[in-house]
Each structure stands twice: as C-alpha cells, then as structure tokens.
C-alpha cells in the first residue's frame, strides 16, 4: 500500500507512517513504529501540555509571584497552566497577567464610569454639567448637583465639575 501523505485527527505523520499524538497532560517519549504504539509519559511536577501533541518536553507552569502583586486564581494541572490574578485594588498589566499595577483613581472633576476589575483598569469620565466630583477615587461616580429648589432654597454659588452648588435662603420681600 502507498504510504500516507496525511493522517487522521490526533495523529501525525512520521517516517511515512501515521502515529497517535500524545493526549493533553502527556509528552512524547518515542514515535510509533510498524510494530509499536506511540509512547507517551505524563508531564511532571509544575508542568503541563494543553493540547494533543508530539512535544518531548512539557511546558512549565506559571507561578503567581506575590512580589508582582499576583495571586493564584487556579493552580496548574498536567493539562492546564496556572491562572494568576491580581490582589484586591490591582489589575493585570497584560492579557497574560504577568504583573499587576494599582487601579488608577479618577481625579476631582472626573467620576468612575467603570470600576476596575482584576484584568481592567478604572475608566474615568469628565463630570458633565449638573454633576461634580470633589475627591480622587477609584469608586466614586460623579454626583448630581444639589437641587436647591426642592429644598425651597436658591442657588447662592453655582456648581462646577469639582464642586456642588451652594444653596441659601430665598430673599423675602418685606411688606
């Protein structure tokens, strides 16, 4: 019979022969032959392979170095890498989450549009007319100006994006 030029899924071509790939969590020790199956061995400690493969070495797990602000979300197995996330108040600097930085705060005049997560930073927005923020915060949204009218008061000092309006009593007309 003609030697194969392509192999089935979960197989690979070597020496004009289709050999089985090693399953996730195992590495290749020796290719199959006419008489023997592919020989695979489990990955060792702190190692993984997450696909059907013909790798002779497993990949090393990541460690969630606390000096970089990281903590363990899910430890690695022979088939998966470790998943790291950031300590409270910090977020990953990249998709791979190799280190963390402190969440940024929104300055006075800006409010939090979206609170930071372990993987994304705080999103700030300028306080629009009618709203203000007088603090630097990673949580506070822009607050609406106080409505003087609903308190039977009048505006004595106009609000800004950083300050609330100042209300005062209405001038009473004397008879």
């Amino acid at each position: 019979p003609e030697p194969p030029t392509a192999c089935r899924e979960k197989q690979y071509l070597i020496n004009s022969q289709c050999c089985s790939l090693c399953q996730p969590g195992q590495k290749l020790v020796s290719d199959c032959t006419e008489f023997t199956e592919t020989e695979c061995l489990p990955c060792g400690e702190s190692e993984f392979l997450d696909t059907w493969n013909r790798e002779t070495h497993c990949h090393q797990h990541k460690y969630c170095d606390p000096n970089l602000g990281l903590r363990v979300q899910q430890k690695g197995t022979s088939e998966t890498d470790t998943i790291c996330t950031c300590e409270e108040g910090w977020h990953c600097t990249s998709e791979a989450c190799e280190s963390c930085v402190l969440h940024r705060s929104c300055s006075p005049g800006f409010g939090v549009k979206q609170i930071a997560t372990g993987v994304s930073d705080t999103i700030c927005e300028p306080c629009p007319v009618g709203f203000f923020s007088n603090v630097s915060s990673a949580f506070e949204k822009c607050h609406p100006w106080t409505s003087c009218e609903t308190k039977d008061l009048v505006v004595q000092q106009a609000g800004t994006n950083k300050t609330d309006v100042v209300c005062g009593p209405q001038d009473r007309l004397r008879a």
Partner: antibody, heavy 120, light 106 residues
Framework: EVQLQQSGAELVKPGASVKLSCTAS????????MHWVKQRPEQGLEWIGR????????KYDPKFQGKATITADTSSNTAYLQLSSLTSEDTAVYYC?????????????WGQGTTVTVSS | DIVLIQSPAIMSASPGEKVTITCSAS?????MHWFQQKPGTSPKVWIY???NLASGVPARFGGSGSGTSYSLTISRMEAEDAATYYC?????????FGAGTKLELK
C-alpha cells in the same frame, strides 16, 4: 506570611504506625500540591509523594507505596503523612514541602521537619 | 525512575576559588532545581528551573544545562557557601534528588 508548622518528634516502636501533620498558614493548601520528603541521618533527600488537596489525588514513589499514605484536610489547611509497619529504616526527618503557586517559584517553603525515631 | 548522579560527592574549595558541581540525569529532563542545606536546617531552594536564583541567593551563584547535563557554579567561593547541594528533577514522577555534594571550605 507563609508558615508551615509540622508536628513534634515521635519515638515509636518497630511495627507501629505514626501520623505526622503539617499545618499551613498564610496560604490555602488547595492552591498547592503538598509533598513529603524523607532524610535519613547523614543521608540525602528522598521524595515520598504528594497530594493535590483540592481533589485528594496522590502520587507516590513506588518504593514508598504501601509504607506511606498522604492525606489532606482542607478545612484545617493541614496535610498528613502516615507511615505504617515501622522499622529502623524509617528513622528519619520528614519534611512537608508545598509546591505553592502563589510563591515566586517552586518549593519556596519547607517545613521545619519532624524527627521520627523507631526504636524498641 | 530518572536517576541523578551528582559529582563530586565531596569537595573543598578555597575562598575566591571557582566551584562547579554537576548533575547528570539518566534520561532527558526539562529543567533542574538545586537546593542548599546546612546541618540541622531544612533545605532551601537555591536555583530553580535550571538557571534562576531564588531570592536572597548571591549573584556569584549560577545554574545552567539542558537534557541530561546540568551544573551549579560559584564564581568565587565564600565561607558562607559551605553546605550540601542537591539537584532535583521534576520532569517525571517519581521526583528524584541527586545524592548531594558536600562543599567544604579549604
């Protein structure tokens, strides 16, 4: 701060069993694999085996199969090593060593060791 | 099992001398860890994943190797380096240690 507190020294008679403990603080043992290592007097290090505390799965060096049993209790954050049918060959210091993924690198922390002396 | 042969078993070095300890594996391994142990104390990870120094380890230490051949080197021996050093592989279960190299100060 990561700390490992191993149980105290044991003097046991040949043929008896002993159960050693290793209580972790500063991390959750479910985020690690808990290993046990043996060191006989004036000798080198021997790996006994390890447990995944998250699911109880264990791996042993075949030469300790039947001699050693590793267990873990996640509620008390403690790993255990039980040694059975003790002989003078089991006289050694036993270390618990977490492979903790919240450390900067593998095997960053070792317990202080528990001395087991087998003598009649 | 993967057998690790360390050499020499025992050696002495003068202060300032270069030291090399080798670890030969019976089968190819992906990486090697090295541990330092002083009498009456628990071992400490000294070099991890072949060439990375653990925190607090002086820069005069180094690690290298691949496949079946690995080594730990000290560029200039110091008194505090006197200890027993063990290599350890984690690429295959059971995990195995070398028999150790006792390094003494001459």
């Amino acid at each position: 701060e990561v700390q490992l507190q191993q149980s105290g020294a044991e003097l046991v008679k040949p043929g008896a069993s002993v159960k050693l403990s290793c209580t972790a603080s500063g991390f959750n043992i479910k985020d690690s694999y808990m290993h046990w290592v043996k060191q006989r007097p004036e000798q080198g290090l021997e790996w006994i085996g390890r447990i995944d505390p998250a699911n109880g799965n264990t791996k042993y060096d075949p030469k300790f199969q039947g001699k050693a049993t590793i267990t873990a209790d996640t509620s008390s954050n403690t790993a255990y090593l039980q040694l059975s049918s003790l002989t003078s060959e089991d006289t050694a210091v036993y270390y618990c060593v977490p492979n903790y993924y919240g450390a900067a690198y593998p095997f960053a922390y070792w317990g202080q060791g528990t001395t087991v002396t087998v003598s009649s | 099992d993967i057998v690790l042969i360390q050499s020499p078993a025992i050696m002495s070095a003068s202060p300032g001398e270069k030291v090399t300890i080798t670890c030969s594996a019976s089968s190819s391994v992906s990486y090697m860890h090295w541990f330092q142990q002083k009498p009456g104390t628990s071992p400490k990870v000294w070099i991890y994943s072949t060439s990375n120094l653990a925190s607090g380890v002086p820069a005069r230490f180094g690690g290298s190797g691949s496949g079946t051949s690995y080594s730990l080197t000290i560029s200039r021996m110091e008194a505090e380096d006197a200890a027993t050093y063990y290599c350890q592989q984690g690429s295959s279960y059971p995990l195995t240690f070398g028999a150790g190299t006792k390094l003494e100060l001459k």
